[in-house]
Structure formats: C-alpha cells, structure tokens
C-alpha cells in the first residue's frame, strides 16, 4: 500500500516551511502559486490530487529535491512543464491524458533505465503510458479533441 | 549483499569527542533516494534517532542534540563519519547506522531497511 | 517531537497464542511508522514498514495495521523464536522518533 498522510487545511499559507515527509493537498481545489516555490525540504510524498490543476508551475517544485512522488490525479492538466518531466527519480501519478506526451517524450530522451511509464483511469486502472499514448493520442485522434484530451476520461 | 558496520573508541572519557564509522556495502551513497542514518540505544532503552545524511550531502540531526553532532560521508570509500563532542556519561549506548534506500515498488516510503550490528560506546571517568 | 508510546512495556505469551502491540503517536503521523523486531544482543531489523506492509522475508504472522495516531502489531500465532523487544517508529516528520519497546517473553 501506498503511504498516506492528513489531508492539510484548505487554508495553505505557501510562506510556511513544511517539515513533514509527506503532504497531502488532495481536494482542496488550491491555485498553484507560480512565483514562489513550496518550501518543502523533507518531503519526498506530495498529494496533489483532485485540485482541478491545469498546469503543474515548475517554479512551485523547484525547491523539493527529496521529492519521489508527485501524485496529481483527478487534474484536467493541459500541459507538463519540461523541467519536472526531467527529473528522472519523480514518480509523476497521473491521469491517461494526452497531455502528458510531452513528459513521455522527455523521459524517454532523457532518462535511462526507468520502469515503463504509467498512467491511471477513471477507474484507478493503471495502463502502460506509452500504449496509451500510441492508441488514444494519434494526430488524427488528438485533433479531433482540440485540446488533445482524452475526453472520456474526464 | 548489503552489510553495513560501525566502529568506535569502545571507552572514552566525558568531554571527549566521539568519532565513528559506518562503513557500508552493496549499495552507492550516491543513488537518488539514498542516505544513512545514526541511531542510538541505551542499555535496556528505546531508539534514539541521532541524524541522517543523503545522498545529495544534505543533512537532518535531532535538535536534541544538533550542537553536539556533525555526520558526513565519503563516498569514495564507502563510510559515514558521527561525531559527538562534549561526550558525557548520558551518551553511553550502542550506536547503529542504518539505510533508507528509495523504494521504487511500494513508493513514498520511508523505513530502515539493514542496521549494522552496532558498537557499544561507555563514557566512563 | 511526535512522541510515540508503546503499551505494554512486556508480555509474557504462550507458544500459538495470539499476541498485539500497541503504538500511540502523539499527532497524525498517517501511515509513517515501521516496526522493527530486536532479538537479544542483536541489532533491529524491520518487519512492518507504512504502517501495514510487510518487509520481504518477513513471515506472514506478523501483521501491521493502524493509521493517524494508533497502530498495531499482531503476531497470530507466536513462535519460540519470536522472543525479542519490538520497538515502532515514525518517520512522517523530523526528528523520527521510536516508541520505547515492548518486550516479548515466552512461557
């Protein structure tokens, strides 16, 4: 089973130090700020979840060097900023979406030796990323979505 | 196989500095996810969490006790150093060097997966 | 510090008997505690870690469960070789902190 920690008040102040090893935001339908960085120096478990992100600000990550995993399910994200998508050690937890290409892509260019990319349905299944992205984000099929989104997903 | 072994004085005398030695094996100090920590028992006593070092170099100590304590690593030679001034006869235990490793199958965690044996330290005038 | 309270401090158990620890967190730790079995002059190993999964090799008696501030370790059927103080600890903030023990005797 995976670790589990206390969700946090939905009144984040993004100036305190967080000294947990593990932090969860899930649900709390926060706003990412993009020009400051979540100070953070312990945690390596960071709950995301179902915060309706589009984008994940990598300023907001710059400063989480123990982070391993990055769970941000149940978010309509449209876009995975490079610098995140390059460190190679982040376990990103994330919705089948066509948006995550990129991530894919990078890692793929960048990253040697790592366990085949994942990512989950609406049912909690896991796929393997890259079929996903072969089967549900063609270009013909990715422009016939407009955003690329794999729109039954969401 | 992963073996991981302290070394010490055995007897030093209160005000002294204690030094010791985690010498490691099977595994890099320099891995992502990696690091060691010092953990300490007294006779017949519970765990006492002393600091940890990761891999990066970075560093967490007890703040019980931060003045006192100072952890480093070599990793050419595969050793992590403690060091403990102003020793008293409260400092007498067994102190342990134990390893987190990143685990990549049940991720998020955080545990101390091998211990060393452990060297017995007596603060004694 | 999260202090972490061990009940009871020792036990004595009969072969096949069913044996629980108890560890009490003084604020939510979620499910950053391990359990860790020391047998007589030796060094602790883990048999719990996450609050409720078992370390590999470790034998499948043993159970951990418990989240937030209150965890168990049971033993289902206690073996001979069980004799050893079981200590718990918490790894969800700084400075981890264990729990003092609890002793295991056999009958």
């Known amino acids: 089973l995976e670790p589990s920690c206390t969700v946090s008040s939905a009144d984040v102040d993004w100036n305190a130090e967080f000294s947990a090893t593990c932090l969860n935001f899930s649900g709390l339908s926060l706003s990412l700020p993009h020009n400051q960085s979540l100070r953070a120096s312990n945690v390596i478990l960071l709950d995301l979840s179902g915060n309706g992100l589009r984008e994940l600000p990598v300023t907001f990550f710059a400063h989480l060097q123990k982070l391993e995993v990055l769970n941000v399910l149940r978010n309509p994200l449209s876009r995975v900023d490079g610098a995140l998508a390059a460190r190679c050690d982040l376990d990103l937890q994330a919705d089948c979406n066509c948006a995550l290409e990129s991530w894919h892509d990078i890692r793929r260019d960048n990253c040697s030796g790592q366990k085949p990319l994942l990512c989950w349905d609406t049912t909690s299944s896991q796929h393997n990323l890259s079929a996903f992205l072969e089967v549900s984000c063609a270009p013909g099929l990715a422009s016939a979505t407009g955003s690329g989104h794999h729109h039954h997903h969401h | 196989q992963i073996t991981l072994k302290e070394s010490g004085p055995g007897i030093l005398q209160p005000s002294q500095t204690l030094s010791l030695t985690c010498s490691f094996s099977?595994?890099?100090?320099?891995?992502?996810?990696?690091?060691v920590s010092w953990i300490r028992q007294p006779s017949g006593k519970g765990l006492e969490w002393l600091a940890h070092?990761?891999?990066?170099?970075?560093?967490r100590y007890n703040p019980s006790l931060r003045s006192r304590l100072t952890i480093s690593k070599d990793t050419s030679s595969n050793q992590v150093v403690l060091k403990l001034t102003n020793v008293d006869t409260a400092d007498t235990a067994t102190y342990y060097c134990?390893?987190?490793?990143?685990?990549?199958?049940?991720?998020?965690?955080?545990?101390?997966?091998?211990w060393g044996a452990g060297t017995t330290v007596t603060v004694s005038s | 510090d999260v202090v972490m309270t061990q009940t009871p401090k020792s036990m004595s158990m009969s072969v096949g008997e069913r044996v629980t620890l108890s560890c009490k967190a003084s604020?939510?730790?979620?499910?950053?505690v391990s359990w860790y079995q020391q047998k007589p002059d030796q060094s602790p190993k883990l048999l719990i870690f996450g609050a409720s999964n078992r370390y590999t090799g470790v034998p499948d008696r043993f159970t951990g469960s418990g989240s937030a501030t209150d965890f168990t370790l049971t033993i289902s059927s206690v073996q001979a070789e069980d004799l050893a103080d079981y200590h718990c600890g918490q790894t969800y903030s700084f400075p981890f902190t264990f729990g003092s023990g609890t002793k295991l005797e056999i009958k």
């Open positions: 604020e939510n730790v979620g499910t950053y």
């Open positions: 099977g595994f890099s100090l320099t891995t992502s996810g990696m690091g």
């Open positions: 134990a390893r987190r490793a990143r685990d990549y199958y049940n991720s998020g965690h955080w545990y101390f997966d091998v």
């Open positions: 070092i990761y891999w990066d170099d970075d560093k």
